[in-house]
């Protein structure tokens, strides 16, 4: 859980409780064990647009 009083992480990043800061989700490809990668899976890094109405 994000520390109280901190700003939400920007798009494409997720809060790391182990490091007490936002971390880039791109690094999860190389190292998926990192604690913040769970947050990356829950929030896709790029906007998603449906291909149908």
């Amino acid at each position: 859980e994000q520390a109280p009083g901190t700003a939400p992480c920007s798009r494409g990043s997720s809060w790391s409780a182990d490091l007490d800061k936002c971390m880039d989700c791109a690094s999860c490809r190389a190292r998926p064990h990192s604690d913040f990668c769970l947050g990356c899976a829950a929030a896709p890094p790029a906007p998603f647009r449906l291909l149908w109405p």
Partner: antibody, heavy 120, light 108 residues
Amino acid sequence: EVQLLESGGGLVQPGGSLRLSCAASGFTFSPYPMMWVRQAPGKGLEWVSYISPSGGSTHYADSVKGRFTISRDNSKNTLYLQMNSLRAEDTAVYYCARGGDTYFDYFDYWGQGTLVTVSS
Amino acid sequence: DIQMTQSPSSLSASVGDRVTITCRASQSISSYLNWYQQKPGKAPKLLIYQASSLQSGVPSRFSGSGSGTDFTLTISSLQPEDFATYYCQQSYTSPFITFGQGTKVEIK
């Protein structure tokens, strides 16, 4: 100059307790993750425990889980390791070490170590 | 857990020799591999981080290479102060890190 100074080691009987301290100086302590590593006499290095910069997240090796507790006091620039239910196999030199400031990829500064001997 | 295996466990070399120590991971760890030097009665000292980056203040005769599962620490020209034990350490699963068993470099 970055310095880490461990203290609190000594001789303790099996089942006993000990509290180790690691006093940090020469750098701003609060942004850095920290860890404890131990080395049994004549053996290699074994990771023991990790704590996040705020102290809100902690991790332990299976060999000490439920018996050891890592903590820190950022206002005192000090890291701690509370060791309970000590066993003969916990006999080792215990080192504290500082993690990198961007990630915990490496540990760049280490204390000189404090010896813990568990024996009856 | 990821196991780290170093070879050889010990080696004898002379001043000026080129020394190579290898470290193998039980699974791929990308480039998340560090090397430490430890002298008797002293704390470990970081030499190389992320497989090939030289830590500040470490002499350039030390170098690291490798990725995936196989890594190498090379001392291009062994100096008297280099006789020590060397450990590799994986940080792929940080903060759950593991060390190799160590390689002792002795005087021939």
